[in-house]
Interface confidence: low
Amino acid sequence: DTEIKVNPPQDFEIVDPGYLGYLYLQWQPPLSLDHFKECTVEYELKYRNIGSETWKTIITKNLHYKDGFDLNKGIEAKIHTLLPWQCTNGSEVQSSWAETTYWISPQGIPETKVQDMDCVYYNWQYLLCSWKPGIGVLLDTNYNLFYWYEGLDHALQCVDYIKADGQNIGCRFPYLEASDYKDFYICVNGSSENKPIRSSYFTFQLQNIVKPLPPVYLTFTRESSCEIKLKWSIPLGPIPARCFDYEIEIREDDTTLVTATVENETYTLKTTNETRQLCFVVRSKVNIYCSDDGIWSEWSDKQCWEGEDLSKKTLLR
């Protein structure tokens, strides 16, 4: 009764197609699979960025897999062949591991790479990224930004740079068709006559860096002798009402400050008959139903009511 053995996959490699972090892991079937012609061989693939504590694990029948990585760090991967128990009249058989690594050899010292990279997707419409030059670079250094997301044939360079003192310090992106809810990859590299410049890689999803416009058309209406309803409207743009959270700041008679977070475009406030003045501002943010994260908008213009008879007034900004 001979022990069943299987070889690891052949030609296991990590291929960089130039998508700034979206890499291909590919391999060939193991040698000597003739005994298992009737059997569907599977592969267990494990991979991670070097320094990460956990491996991602995939079991597949394919000869390739694609995923995004942080190219600021190295990548390591390993794969072995699995023969399901149906093929071996018993327990599952595993080959030894085939292993491979990939990294982009870093150029220049860390101080030369861009600092404080900040990207904001304004109103889910306009992407703008800005950065500061590395703290160890001269004015002859210039930075270039490249980006890619699934749907583009190849990485594209920024065509509309923001400049200061002749250096590129930001990028205004063109309209980015079908670019949300998927990984968006950026590389900022640089060139200098004096020294090599360290590249930086960034990955995010656009819906998580949205900064909406502030709410508009703030109004007051008296609901009862002791209740006032505050209302506002969502700003123009592509963000649907269901995607907003709001934060309200209310000041009564210049003393009490009330803050509240709500999901709708209204807020009911308890007041007393002694209230002489009421002011409020609102700001908005994309909520957890539409993104994992977001940036608060600027505050709206302040809307105030002063006087005796709130019941006769509905104030529009």
Epitope: I50, G51, N72, K73, G74, W103, S105, P106, I109, P110, E111, I135, G136, V137, L138
Partner: antibody, heavy 119, light 111 residues
Framework: QVQLVQSGAEVVKPGASVKVSCKAS????????MNWVRQAPGQGLEWIGR????????HYNQKFKDRVTMTVDTSTSTVYMELSSLRSEDTAVYYC????????????WGQGTLVTVSS | DIQMTQSPSSLSASVGDRVTITCRAS??????????MNWFQQKPGKAPKLLIY???RQGSGDPSRFSGSGSGTDFTLTISSLQPEDFATYFC?????????FGQGTKVEIK
Amino acid sequence: QVQLVQSGAEVVKPGASVKVSCKASGYTFTNYWMNWVRQAPGQGLEWIGRIDAYAGETHYNQKFKDRVTMTVDTSTSTVYMELSSLRSEDTAVYYCARGYGDAYGMDHWGQGTLVTVSS
Amino acid sequence: DIQMTQSPSSLSASVGDRVTITCRASESVDNYGISFMNWFQQKPGKAPKLLIYAASRQGSGDPSRFSGSGSGTDFTLTISSLQPEDFATYFCQQSKEVPWTFGQGTKVEIK
């Protein structure tokens, strides 16, 4: 939190070698350099060299260049410093210290390893 | 090698005093618009602790009473109001050129 844990004290004979380890945790190991600094009893600080935990590149103080070897094991997040042809004046506390880049300083240090060279 | 000279080598001060330690490099430690100068605090039997990097930037979690200044060859560490836990030895260090070099240290003692 960031921790650098060094191997224990060593007593070695003149002419021998010593290998000190520094195990890092609490941060992305390969993003940083590891420096080695020594301090003889009652004396100041002396920089021995550093190793890039990502690429294994080393920069040594010329004073130690022929006697020091720094290595890195990324699988265990450990850096090693080996000093050979030891003499009595190498008796010192040896520290590992993390650094991001030249301008950022050495922001976390190991607890130190006392190496005593004595016959 | 760049030589680092600290002064004074020791000083006595009282809690609440303003303390200034100076460090002079044998050549400029400025490069690319930044000063590659760091300051460390060391207490007996302990590892050094980074206080200031790039001449004036505070290390993480360090009290604001520690500040650094200077450029080129002359640098200063200032403790605005000395606290009991500040009695220690202070070292300057340049990281512009390998080998990185330290000052000989300034011991701050209780008066």
